[in-house]
């Protein structure tokens, strides 16, 4: 999450010993309060591994460290999904999995983690400095995204930091460690607050920036607990982007937007953009490959072209993705 909260600046205390001590005891509670507020913030981890057997084959593993239920997971490369990245796979916990080349196999590992194997050959195969991103959506609470890539000096078979091999144990140790520190911090904060209970409250100085806190992104929840999680995105090396699988629409807008009804409630079903036959029941999909329809089994890859939904001010390159016309 990248929701930001503004903390009002405190009026500096009077100089002198009391002022210096007062300043320290005033700053510390704010720091501890921020830690306490963000203690329950869900996080996403990403592990990128190059297979020793196939040098250009990658395994991406992603996990969600949070208590909320996941409604959708999107894996992309070349940057965050929706910001120039190309979608590789979309996983729904109940309805199935859809994936696009060069993704070979996407699957759920646990209820909160997924893995994706990428094909090792072809023009669209990844290379060592490709950035992979995972976005976990929990509708309507919010969505959390993190990115990772192989370190430049990675040997085949080695996984990218920061996630060690026994992920579950490492995560657990981290959670316990951080929880311990935060618990101590929260207790200390309460102690400080009780000590300062009878002192006059410091005057709050309005923040120099806009009085209104910046609104979270469209998908971000408006919870204060999401305040301090800033996911650093790795720099995208454009020379190592996947091959242009999709072509942007010449007019910049989505090719299907104009075909949607402007007033009528029900329109007759015309020729579909990617599957004119009715979509089968849960657990079964219509796959479109080379213009041929094929009925697939339970949770197969859904290699279907899509359409760009919205225009992009940055031009055609940003429109690359599973929604371009193949």
């Amino acid at each position: 999450m990248r929701t930001e909260a503004q903390v009002p600046a405190l009026q500096p205390p009077e100089p002198g010993l009391e002022g210096a001590m007062g300043h320290r005891t005033l700053v510390l509670p704010w720091v501890l309060l921020t830690l306490c507020v963000t203690a329950g913030t869900p996080e996403v981890w990403v592990q990128v591994r190059m297979e020793a057997t196939e040098l250009s084959s990658f395994t991406i593993r992603c996990g969600f460290l949070g208590s909320g239920s996941i409604s959708l997971v999107t894996v992309s490369w070349g940057g965050p999904n929706g910001a120039g990245g190309t979608t590789l796979a979309v996983l729904h916990p109940e309805r199935g999995i859809r994936q696009w080349a060069p993704a070979r196999q996407a699957r759920w590992e646990t209820q909160s983690s997924i893995s994706l194997i990428l094909e090792g050959s072809g023009a669209s195969s990844p290379c060592a400095n490709t950035t992979f991103c995972c976005k976990f959506a929990s509708f309507p609470e919010g969505s959390w995204e993190a990115c990772g890539s192989l370190p430049p000096s990675s040997d085949p078979g080695l996984s990218a930091p920061p996630t060690p091999a026994p992920i579950l144990r490492a995560d657990l140790a981290g959670i316990l460690g951080v929880s311990g520190v935060l618990l101590f911090g929260c207790v200390y904060l309460l102690h400080l607050l009780r000590r300062h209970k009878h002192r006059p409250a410091p005057r709050l100085q309005p923040s120099r920036t806009s009085p209104q806190a910046p609104r979270a992104r469209a998908w971000a929840p408006s919870q204060a607990s999401q305040a301090a999680l800033h996911v650093p995105y790795a720099t995208i090396n454009t020379s190592c982007r996947p091959a242009t699988l999709d072509t942007a629409h010449p007019h910049g807008g989505p090719s299907w937007w104009a075909s949607l009804p402007t007033h009528a409630a029900h329109r007759p079903q015309g020729p579909a953009a990617w599957a004119s036959t009715p979509i089968p029941a849960r657990g079964s999909f219509v796959s479109v490959e080379n213009g041929l329809y094929a009925q697939a089994g339970e949770r197969p890859p859904h290699t279907g072209p899509g359409l760009t939904l919205f225009p992009d001010p940055r031009g055609p390159r940003a429109m690359e993705g599973p929604l371009g016309v193949r």
């Epitope: 309805r95 976005k135 309507p140």
Partner: nanobody, 121 residues
Framework: EVQLVESGGGLVQPGGSLRLSCAAS????????MGWFRQAPGKGLDEGVA????????KYADSVKGRFTISHGNAKYILYLQMNSLRAEDTAVYYC??????????????WGQGTQVTVSS
């Protein structure tokens, strides 16, 4: 990131009408469906009040068929939901969302902050 901003919610009497709007802006969204979802107070999220996929197929929840109409603005990227003959059970936070189709259902990947619709006399 794609930004979806809903508007048009409010308080309306039973039998009344409201028109919700969803303005889409920002970067490319890589999905294949859009629609309106709602969450009633103390209840779970509805599968999808009204959704459109990239083939132009429209799907309505049984509870709103014949009363709600989903449509779009051609020039600007705006999605609408015309709600007529509103009932008390339509009271909810309505979300505009864009996502991916699974088994004929639109699963949200990006959504707005929601707009409150209250149907009460």
């Amino acid at each position: 990131e794609v930004q979806l901003v809903e508007s048009g919610g409010g308080l309306v009497q039973p039998g009344g009408s409201l028109r919700l709007s969803c303005a889409a802006s920002g970067f490319t969204f890589s999905g294949d469906c859009m629609g309106w979802f709602r969450q009633a107070p103390g209840k779970g999220l509805d599968e999808g009040v009204a959704t459109i996929d990239n083939a132009g197929r429209i799907k309505y929840a049984d509870s709103v068929k014949g009363r709600f109409t989903i449509s779009h603005g051609n020039a600007k990227y705006i999605l609408y939901l015309q709600m007529n003959s509103l009932r008390a059970e339509d009271t909810a936070v309505y979300y505009c969302a864009a996502g991916w189709t699974f088994g004929g259902q639109c699963s949200p990947a990006d959504w707005g902050q929601g707009t409150q619709v209250t149907v009460s006399s």
